[in-house]
Interface confidence: low
């Protein structure tokens, strides 16, 4: 358990005196005294504290600016931020998201392994052994080659990790 | 109205121990602390430590950390500080008085001798 | 420790006078506080956070200073302010008092 504190939860100590913090959503004004309670007031429009505090300003409300790629994904309320995240297409930078930028392609042998979202990249991988990718796509996966057998064709042209395998007619003079 | 009342005065001889009491009226008594302020004959003023009733944390003057422990009732609404090993310098008044020292007890005299 | 030292030691003046009494800080402190003390009787919060008038004081009693210089000062004697007076600080552990200043009737 926590050892025990000179003063109580949500109080805290200045001048030998155990005062209130303010509640979320207010700043503080100017502290208690043996006579005067703890003053506090409430953040002013697009500010914000989001904890009990001994603040002497509130916090701006986080911009989400267009030019970085930016939208707001939840607005701030007096107790906390703005939330912003990444335009269609784009994704944040950074966990706090500051800036955003393009989704990657997965280029031609390289398939979407997970498509991308507002905070993460595009994750590409590898085409293996059967499959190919032969565009630069931010959200297509590779795909199988052709299985020239079900459909009663033979291989003309092998696969690659960028190309599908060419399948032709059966030679029948060799059956 | 606020009040603190403390225990009479006592006669000591030098070794013993002696409690002192101090029980607070007119307020909430966790919500500040007590302290405990010693004034030795014709003197000034020295503190000695508090305790914060809400649960029980105590901060002591070094000076007095072997001296005193201070200790508090939330049952009755009282504090405490038992004084041990007195000596002859431990004669005193002895005062609670609560955070901020807008109250004091009246004080109590502490006569440590053989 | 932060020591208080006050001076005057004595101050003698006579009912009607204005009284200065000080009180300096070995090292910076963030408020002082004052009290009177009367034979027999234990101390009174006259002034705390350096300029707040306690509950009950009359307005004659004011103080003032920051850092590591106080002063408390009574704008006209009464003849009931002959007494002692202690000021004291809170800022930091152990909370100490200065030695006291002791206010006659000259």
């Known amino acids: 358990p926590e050892p025990p504190t000179a003063c109580r939860e949500k109080q805290y100590l200045i001048n030998s005196q155990c005062c209130s913090l303010c509640q979320p959503g207010q700043k503080l004004v100017s502290d208690c005294t043996e006579f005067t309670e703890t003053e506090c007031l409430p953040c002013g429009e697009s500010e914000f504290l989001d904890t009990w505090n001994r603040e002497t300003h509130c916090h701006q409300h986080k911009y989400c600016d267009p030019n970085l790629g930016l939208r707001v994904q939840q607005k701030g309320t007096s107790e906390t931020d703005t939330i912003c995240t990444c335009e269609e297409g784009w994704h944040c930078t950074s966990e706090a998201c500051e800036s955003c930028v393009l989704h990657r392609s997965c280029s031609p042998g390289f398939g979407v392994k997970q498509i991308a979202t507002g905070v993460s990249d595009t994750i590409c991988e590898p085409c293996p052994v059967g499959f190919f990718s032969n565009v630069s796509s931010a959200f297509e996966k590779c795909h199988p080659w052709t299985s020239c057998e079900t459909k009663d064709l033979v291989v003309q042209q092998a696969g690659t990790n960028k190309t599908d395998v060419v399948c032709g007619p059966q030679d029948r003079l060799r059956a | 109205q606020v009040q603190l009342v403390q225990s009479g005065a006592e006669v000591k001889k030098p070794g013993s121990s002696v409690k002192v009491s101090c029980k607070a009226s007119?307020?909430?008594?966790?919500?500040?602390?007590m302290h405990w302020v010693r004034q030795a004959p014709g003197q000034g003023l020295e503190w000695i430590g508090y305790?914060?009733?809400?649960?029980?944390?105590?901060k002591y003057n070094q000076k007095f950390k072997d001296k005193a422990t201070i200790t508090a009732d939330e049952s009755t609404n009282t504090a405490y500080m038992e004084l041990s090993s007195l000596r002859s310098e431990d004669t005193a008044v002895y005062y609670c008085?609560?955070?901020?020292?807008?109250?004091w007890g009246q004080g109590t005299l502490v006569t440590v001798s053989s | 420790e932060i020591v208080l030292t006050q001076s005057p030691a004595t101050l003698s003046l006579s009912p009607g006078e204005r009284a200065t009494l000080s009180c300096s800080a070995s090292?910076?402190?963030?408020?002082m506080h004052w009290y009177q003390q009367k034979p027999g009787q234990a101390p009174r919060l006259l002034i705390y956070?350096?300029?707040k008038l306690a509950s009950g004081i009359p307005a004659r009693f004011s103080g003032s200073g920051s850092g590591t210089d106080f002063t408390l000062t009574i704008s006209s004697l009464e003849p009931e302010d002959f007494a002692v007076y202690y000021c004291?600080?809170?800022?930091?552990?152990?909370?100490?008092f200065g030695q006291g200043t002791k206010l006659e009737i000259k």
């Open positions: 090292s910076s402190v963030s408020y």
């Open positions: 008085a609560r955070q901020g020292f807008p109250y």
């Open positions: 007119g307020y909430t008594f966790t919500n500040y602390w």
């Open positions: 004291h600080q809170l800022s930091s552990d152990p909370f100490t």
């Open positions: 305790i914060n009733p809400s649960n029980d944390y105590t």
């Open positions: 956070d350096t300029s």
